[in-house]
């Protein structure tokens, strides 16, 4: 059993049929010695009686909140939360597996710079009862801070006959250098509590590699005279890392037709801008990358053709 | 401050092109190891990262940009040298920062070469024949070192009378490389903001 | 006291362009998630955007995706919703909330989307 926060508790426990279970002491946190009873949630009926009680924890029935009264007034309370653990395996019932970029990922991380503020969000099928707690650091031997604000509900959609919802966090390296190297990984750790059964989930990643650039902006078509052929031109997004002589990008451009089964032209380039042949009907689209580290391509910025 | 895209320099020219070749070939040698080598902690998840010019080199700090110098973050403890201008010791307008830069990227160069070549040695003697260096790879570095153009004693390779760890050889061939493709970047990005500065 | 205070909505064409404004007072805004949610006539609350409180991070309904841009001015605590290519079915009372159930959110306003 560990202390989770001030008054809650974690009780690990191995999960198979007839599992014995975990012997707990819950003390009542008081000076008074005699007249002490102990009951359960919202139960009236009395567990126990004295300044301790000790139960034997072995399925979620056993959880929830207890309480020590004296006289019809209450002492201290002490929650029980249950840690699942189900062939050596930690249980993860509470997020689901995103299976991107692998499978067991339950956390995803992305950053639009090297600025060291990055995003995480994971998603769940519960739509009550729930609540996150984000902790990070770089490095976890001797870990240097990292600030996060508070987990919250960022998105919800439909998937089949199930409600999705997306939990996002913020998080800032609280002295980041944009040109360091890194040799220690941010790591992120997730409580999670769902009701009565608490879960932990983490995530451990470089800042480079979970790199993915806005679109580029003002994205721009010039005709070339007498000629199918424009010059397309577009700028950094403001959110990418300055000097961009530094960090420089590197730049997809694509030429669609209406049909996605049309075959499409590509070009590769370093400049904000490239010379390609409009099609009628066609839209083109620009996204970036870091020209020097290989991460995610941004998602496309696209001008129609006409 | 955004740098306009101006016609390089041709004498920085050279060491952006062999910094462009150097990131290629250490990052191609990378995946091939991760390839060949599968089974082995050969990912960056997997690998203790280390590098081993530290306290011995200092090329983040000497080679940052100028708008990063505000950054406090970015000055660290160490006395900081700020790049300028430059165009890769052909211009007589070189300042000393620059030079404690480039001279910077050199010792990193010189430390890697002596490293690879002494651990290439080690895996021509494995009878496995598994996987040796990229003999482009330490070609680029030798071009680059060249282009930067210091003059420095000639390291020797370290030579070990121990008969060597193989297995050893190839996870440490994994830490080295993740580590070099790491700097290759930096140094590919201090030379591109020289070539526009 | 926590305001949050929409602007510009108005009758539109179906394929025109609309510009939402929010203005935040009584609270924390640079540190705060912010949404965009909206009532269609006679239906309940539905989710439109997120965007997290340093404007890097963005979500959007489905029904809206790559049509409407949320962003934020954390200088002059605003929040903006721009909204291209508008269909008849985007016709709704919209409001700028601190929450995604939009249980905390300002009065409204109204957004009309017709021939």
């Known amino acids: 059993i560990w202390e989770l926060k001030k008054d809650v508790y974690v009780v690990e426990l191995d999960w198979y049929p007839d599992a014995p279970g975990e012997m707990v002491v819950l003390t009542c946190d008081t000076p008074e010695e005699d007249g002490i009873t102990w009951t359960l949630d919202q139960s009236s009926e009395v567990l126990g009686s004295g300044k301790t009680l000790t139960i034997q924890v072995k399925e979620f029935g056993d959880a929830g909140q207890y309480t020590c009264h004296k006289g019809g007034e209450v002492l201290s309370h002490s929650l029980l939360l249950l840690h699942k653990k189900e062939d050596g395996i930690w249980s993860t019932d509470i997020l689901k597996d995103q299976k991107e970029p692998k499978n067991k990922t339950f956390l995803r991380c992305e950053a639009k710079n090297y600025s060291g503020r990055f995003t995480c969000w994971w998603l769940t099928t519960i739509s009550t009862d729930l609540t996150f707690s984000v902790k990070s650091s770089r490095g976890s031997s001797d870990p240097q801070g990292v600030t996060c604000g508070a987990a919250t509900l960022s998105a919800e959609r439909v998937r089949g006959d199930n409600k999705e919802y997306e939990y996002s966090v913020e998080c800032q390296e609280d002295s980041a250098c944009p040109a360091a190297e890194e040799s220690l990984p941010i790591e992120v750790m997730v409580d999670a509590v769902h009701k009565l059964k608490y879960e932990n989930y983490t995530s451990s990643f470089f800042i480079r590699d979970i790199i993915k650039p806005d679109p580029p902006k003002n994205l721009q078509l010039k005709p070339l005279k007498n000629s199918r052929q424009v010059e397309v031109s577009w700028e950094y997004p403001d959110t990418w890392s300055t000097p961009h002589s530094y960090f420089s990008l590197t730049f997809c451009v694509q030429v669609q037709g209406k049909s996605k089964r049309e075959k499409k032209d590509r070009v590769f380039t370093d400049k904000t801008s490239a010379t390609v042949i409009c099609r009628k009907n066609a839209s083109i689209s620009v996204r970036a990358q870091d020209r020097y580290y290989s991460s995610s391509w941004s998602e496309w910025a696209s001008v129609p053709c006409s | 401050r955004n740098l306009p895209v101006a016609t390089p320099d041709p004498g920085m020219f050279p060491c952006l092109h062999h910094s462009q070749n150097l990131l290629r070939a250490v990052s191609n040698m990378l995946q091939k190891a991760r390839q060949t080598l599968e089974f082995y902690p050969c990912t960056s998840e997997e690998i203790d990262h280390e590098d081993i010019t530290k306290d011995k080199t200092s090329t983040v700090e000497a080679c940052l940009p100028l708008e990063l110098t505000k950054n406090e973050s970015c000055l660290n403890s160490r006395e900081t040298s700020f790049i300028t201008n430059g165009s890769c010791l052909a211009s007589r307008k070189t300042s000393f920062m620059m030079a404690l830069c480039l001279s910077s990227i050199y010792e990193d160069l010189k430390m890697y070469q002596v490293e690879f070549k002494t651990m290439n040695a080690k895996l021509l003697m494995d009878p496995k024949r598994q996987i040796f260096l990229d003999q482009n790879m330490l070609a680029v570095i030798d071009e680059l070192m060249q282009a930067l153009n210091f003059n420095s004693e000639t390291v020797p390779q370290k030579s070990s009378l121990e008969e060597p760890d193989f297995y050893k050889t190839k996870i440490k061939l994994c830490i080295l490389l993740h580590a070099f493709r790491i700097r290759a970047v930096t140094i590919d990005r201090v030379m591109s903001y020289l070539n526009a500065s | 006291e926590v305001q949050l205070v929409e602007s510009g909505g108005g009758l539109v064409q179906p394929g025109g362009s609309l510009r939402l404004s929010c203005a935040a007072s009584?609270?924390?805004?640079?540190?705060?998630?912010m949404f965009w949610v909206r009532q269609p006539p006679g239906k309940g609350l539905e989710w439109v955007s997120t965007?997290?409180?340093?404007?890097?991070?963005?979500r959007y309904a489905d029904s809206v995706q790559g049509r409407f841009t949320i962003s934020r001015d954390n200088t002059k605590n605003t929040l903006s919703l721009q909204m291209n290519s508008l269909k008849p079915e985007d016709t709704a009372l919209y409001y700028c909330?601190?929450?995604?159930?939009?249980?905390?959110r300002g009065q409204g306003t109204q957004v009309t989307v017709s021939s």
């Open positions: 009584g609270f924390s805004f640079s540190s705060s998630w």
């Open positions: 909330a601190r929450d995604l159930r939009g249980t905390m």
């Open positions: 965007i997290s409180p340093s404007g890097d991070y963005s």
